[in-house]
Interface confidence: medium
């Protein structure tokens, strides 16, 4: 079941709960981090446990055999169920900004496409309380900054309208 | 508006440490990193590194990591690089510059600071 | 480290003419690049970021292109306060390296 660290707003689905395949990788971030970029899959949205146990699952397949990586890219990925899911979690480097912002950052990525409609209140809530919990436990500055992914990189990504949105959020600072 | 205050130049005796100072103003000095940057007379750019005044978070070049120290001091707002054991070749322009916002390309760039490592 | 190689080393133009600068990376950068224009005496200034992306202040007739490890600087009709040093950055990885640098002079 999920995991709820008493400094978190939102559980967190471990690995194993959504059955991913064991992670190869093995570059450490150096906590706590600057940094966090918002993406999102572009990919199906899911809005119960067992969907977005799938989503995330599809997602790691195609990153691991289709791109070659690791694991997911992702540190965390956000359901419109509500919950976290662990990708590489606080401690392990990701792929999903690059190589400059990868090692200084924690990637968090909405399962879904926000090109033309916002995440349910229920992922955004969660994802605002994986922040609590990053800088609640050490693995996020308190003075964090938030990226969204196309600030970083030239993507559309995180789509316009989860783009807009969390430029309204505290720690956005826009490129 | 964005602002970097550098002094126009430093006479060093060789291996006599020297400190170089960029007072910034017209911004939040906690908020974004300061970098340094080196210009040999007639050469190129080079970086040095990074300092984020916030925490002292610094990434430095590690080509400068036994020359060069970065601070700051957050009261005046001001950054500082300390050059240890100067020798000829470390006679240039300094400079300091502020990113855009991050890694987004040196915006605001200060004068400059011209060492000069001479007996 | 990556790095940065810019031709021509000098470019002789006459105001009006449209010049390109190249800037090649040793590996691919994305777009992770910047470039500068540093007049004598001067501190260099930011003229575009990200391979392509405009600065507020910077004249329209400077402009970039490319991606991956090839980019190019263009200045579609030079003014004779165009003269001086043109760099470019490597915005990538660390450490941030700038180019050799291309002098643009007036013929």
């Known amino acids: 079941q999920e995991t709820e660290d008493p400094a978190c707003c939102s559980p967190i689905v471990p690995r194993n709960e959504w059955k991913a395949l064991a992670s190869e990788c093995a570059q450490h971030l150096s906590l706590p981090l600057r940094y966090v970029v918002v993406s999102h899959t572009a990919g199906s949205s899911c809005n119960t446990p067992a969907s977005c146990q799938q989503q995330a699952r599809n997602v790691q397949h195609y990153h691991m055999k289709t791109l070659g990586w690791c694991d997911v890219g992702y540190n965390f990925l956000i359901g419109e169920d509500g919950l976290v899911y662990e990708g590489r979690g606080w401690n392990f480097t990701g792929a999903h900004s690059g190589h400059l912002w990868n090692p200084m950052s924690i990637g968090i990525s909405f399962m879904g496409n926000y090109m033309d409609r916002v995440p349910t209140p229920q992922a955004i809530r969660a994802a605002q309380g994986l922040l609590a919990c990053g800088v609640a436990q050490g693995a996020l500055r308190s003075n964090y900054v938030l990226k969204g992914h196309r600030d970083v990189q030239r993507t559309l990504s995180p789509g316009n309208q989860l783009y807009h949105l969390i430029q309204n959020w505290p720690h956005y600072r826009s490129p | 508006q964005v602002q970097l205050q550098q002094p126009g130049a430093e006479l060093v005796r060789p291996g006599a440490s020297v400190k170089l100072s960029c007072k910034a103003s017209?911004?939040?000095?906690?908020?974004?990193?300061m970098n340094w940057v080196k210009q040999r007379p007639g050469q190129g750019l080079e970086w040095i590194g990074m300092i984020h005044p916030s925490d002292s978070e610094t990434r430095l070049n590690q080509k400068f990591k036994d020359k060069a120290t970065l601070t700051v001091d957050k009261s005046s707002s001001t950054a500082y690089m300390q050059l240890s054991s100067p020798t000829s070749e470390d006679s240039a322009v300094y400079y300091c510059?502020?990113?855009?916002?991050?890694?987004?390309?040196?915006?605001?760039w200060g004068q400059g600071t011209l060492v000069t490592v001479s007996a | 480290d990556i790095v940065m190689t810019q031709s021509p080393a000098t470019l002789s133009v006459t105001p009006g003419d449209r010049v390109s600068l190249s800037c090649r990376a040793s590996?691919?950068?994305?777009?992770?690049l910047h470039w500068y224009q540093q007049k004598s005496h001067e501190s260099p200034r930011l003229l575009i970021k990200?391979?392509?992306q405009s600065i507020s202040g910077i004249p329209s007739r400077f402009s970039g292109s490319g991606s991956g490890s090839d980019f190019t600087l263009s200045i579609n009709s030079v003014e004779p306060e165009d003269v001086g040093v043109y760099y470019c950055q490597n915005g990538h990885s660390f450490p941030l390296t700038f180019g050799t640098g291309t002098k643009l002079e007036l013929k």
């Open positions: 017209g911004y939040s000095f906690t908020s974004y990193w």
């Open positions: 990200y391979a392509s």
């Open positions: 590996q691919s950068i994305s777009d992770y």
């Open positions: 510059a502020r990113d855009y916002s991050d890694y987004d390309g040196f915006a605001y």
